[in-house]
Amino acid sequence: QGCGEDKICQSNLQLVRARFCTRVSDTEFQPLPMDVDGTTALFALSGQPVIGLELMVTNLPSDPAQPQADGDDAHEAQLLVMLPDSLHYSGVRALDPAEKPLCLSNENASHVECELGNPMKRGAQVTFYLILSTSGISIETTELEVELLLATISEQELHPVSARARVFIELPLSIAGMAIPQQLFFSGVVRGERAMQSERDVGSKVKYEVTVSNQGQSLRTLGSAFLNIMWPHEIANGKWLLYPMQVELEGGQGPGQKGLCSPRPNILHLDVDSRDR
Amino acid sequence: ELEPPEQQEPGERQEPSMSWWPVSSAEKKKNITLDCARGTANCVVFSCPLYSFDRAAVLHVWGRLWNSTFLEEYSAVKSLEVIVRANITVKSSIKNLMLRDASTVIPVMVYLDPMAVVAE
């Protein structure tokens, strides 16, 4: 039954889609952006506990003009999934539960077998999502590669296919800044640099606050970060513009410690106006 | 940008003199932007290492507008915008590390105020 007039089941199982996705909700997934090569997905390691692998399998005639040539029922149709050390199987989802295959994994969740039907009928088409835990991905992981192999006892030659994603670690750092006040005024008389004794002699005061927020893991594991401020100290002809009096980093140095930035400000060693701090 | 920037020490300043940049050229520009990224100002880069960074860090920078320069160079200008830029860089052996939107621009407007006292 389902094997055509020759009574030989010549199936045409095809893995027409295998792409990595972000899990949006329990049964909703969005494809990851693609690398410039158009075949490799880009996976940002920033707190995503799982990654989805969208799989679409069909059993259709290879040539619609000759539908009897193949596309017969695929008996004991299966998809075999080999996962890298960085990924572990945690479940399977389908938009329609009637299309959810039975997937069973080995003890360490590195090898998965999904039953696609016995038989997977002529004309059948199923789409489902493997949910893969990303807990095994480390900062050394640069690529994810999942090997996929369709199998059936019907007559068909099948070859493994790979789904790939390039892993990059996106530091979830954000930066915001403000100036107090946001408007400054100048007036009075011109004075030479050597006439300056105190910072109050220089001109209107301004304070900049730059806040860096880290929504992810501690940076200690990733390397050393620097907060840089491009301070316009002089105009194009070399005259002073904004004189830097004091630079202080709060946080980022451990509890209660104040950080040192380089170079040191206040190179003219002007007296600090303590009322301004 | 994954490397800390090269440091640049501000040099000793000369006594103010009449600028070689005539006032008339500033007069033509009623609104001027002073921004190192555009080449209209020179910057010193203050770099602060974030050693132990779990949630947030705040950089405070106190400065003073160099009043004399503005009187000499920009007294005929309607308004000036002074741009301070800040960013985060990471030095790491990890090749696949990426920073997104790790920079900010902080503008300050500067005006001539004939009524103001210079210091405050």
């Epitope: 479940g91 399977v92 539960p97 009637a98 069973l104 | -």
Partner: antibody, heavy 121, light 112 residues
Framework: EVQLVQSGAEVKKPGSSVKVSCKAS????????MHWVRQAPGQGLEWIGK????????RLNQEFRDRATLTVDKSTSTAYMELSSLRSEDTAVYYC??????????????WGQGTLVTVSS | DIVMTQSPLSLPVTPGEPASISCRSS???????????LHWYLQKPGQSPQLLIY???NRFAGVPDRFSGSGSGTDFTLKISRVEAEDVGVYFC?????????FGGGTKLEIK
């Protein structure tokens, strides 16, 4: 022999919760969905929801979304259905039923004996 | 939700006579995978429901061949060629094409 054995009858007060268990035997627990269906006295059958024991995926009837919780314990091949904020209208016999997987076997082929839950003040 | 409507509500039958129960769905039960998930259950007095027919016309294991199912789309029928005394109970049709799965109101078959 494939069997689903449910916990005993319960009498509950309005506003409280009830947790009904369903122990499976005679088959591979993770190879079939487990459905929950209820039947009020003298009434028809109402589908509550289902759970896939292999990965705990749950699909619930919208009517029960806020009140029903389906769970499984793979180590004991037991499924559970908890219904909270009970009202008198929840008085019914609650059945667990084995559901086929994928393709044509999309039906309830084995049913538990039922658990009568009576909600009364 | 798909509404399943059964008729008649009650069906008195003489043993040895045929019986027919109709089930109509508010929308087509043909799934996009080509299967039609319409099933028939029998609930004997004081018992749990038991599966008779699945996928419109497939008899479940151990079900006597006097039971048959037919239909397509939205109209389905369960036929008993010769009713026996043990066939008494309430017959339910059910759909599992679309969530939430729904049951018909039931048809009570009794012996005359």
């Amino acid at each position: 022999e494939v069997q689903l054995v449910q916990s005993g009858a319960e009498v509950k007060k309005p506003g409280s919760s009830v947790k009904v268990s369903c122990k499976a035997s005679g088959y591979s627990f993770t190879r079939y969905w487990m459905h929950w269906v209820r039947q009020a006295p003298g009434q028809g059958l109402e589908w509550i929801g289902k759970i896939d024991p292999s990965d705990s995926e749950t699909r619930l009837n919208q009517e029960f979304r806020d009140r029903a919780t389906l769970t499984v314990d793979k180590s004991t091949s037991t499924a559970y259905m908890e219904l909270s904020s009970l009202r008198s209208e929840d008085t019914a016999v609650y059945y667990c039923a084995r559901g086929g997987y994928f393709g044509e076997k999309w039906y309830h082929d084995v049913w538990g004996q039922g658990t009568l839950v009576t909600v009364s003040s | 939700d798909i509404v399943m409507t059964q008729s008649p509500l009650s069906l008195p039958v003489t043993p040895g006579e045929p019986a027919s129960i109709s089930c109509r769905s508010s929308q087509s039960l043909v799934h996009r995978n080509g299967n039609t998930y319409l099933h028939w259950y029998l609930q004997k007095p004081g018992q749990s429901p038991q599966l008779l027919i699945y996928g419109v016309s497939n008899r479940f294991a151990g079900v006597p061949d006097r039971f048959s199912g037919s239909g397509s789309g939205t109209d389905f029928t369960l036929k008993i060629s010769r009713v026996e005394a043990e066939d008494v109970g309430v017959y339910f049709c059910a759909q599992s094409t679309q969530l939430p799965y729904t049951f018909g109101g039931g048809t009570k078959l009794e012996i005359k």
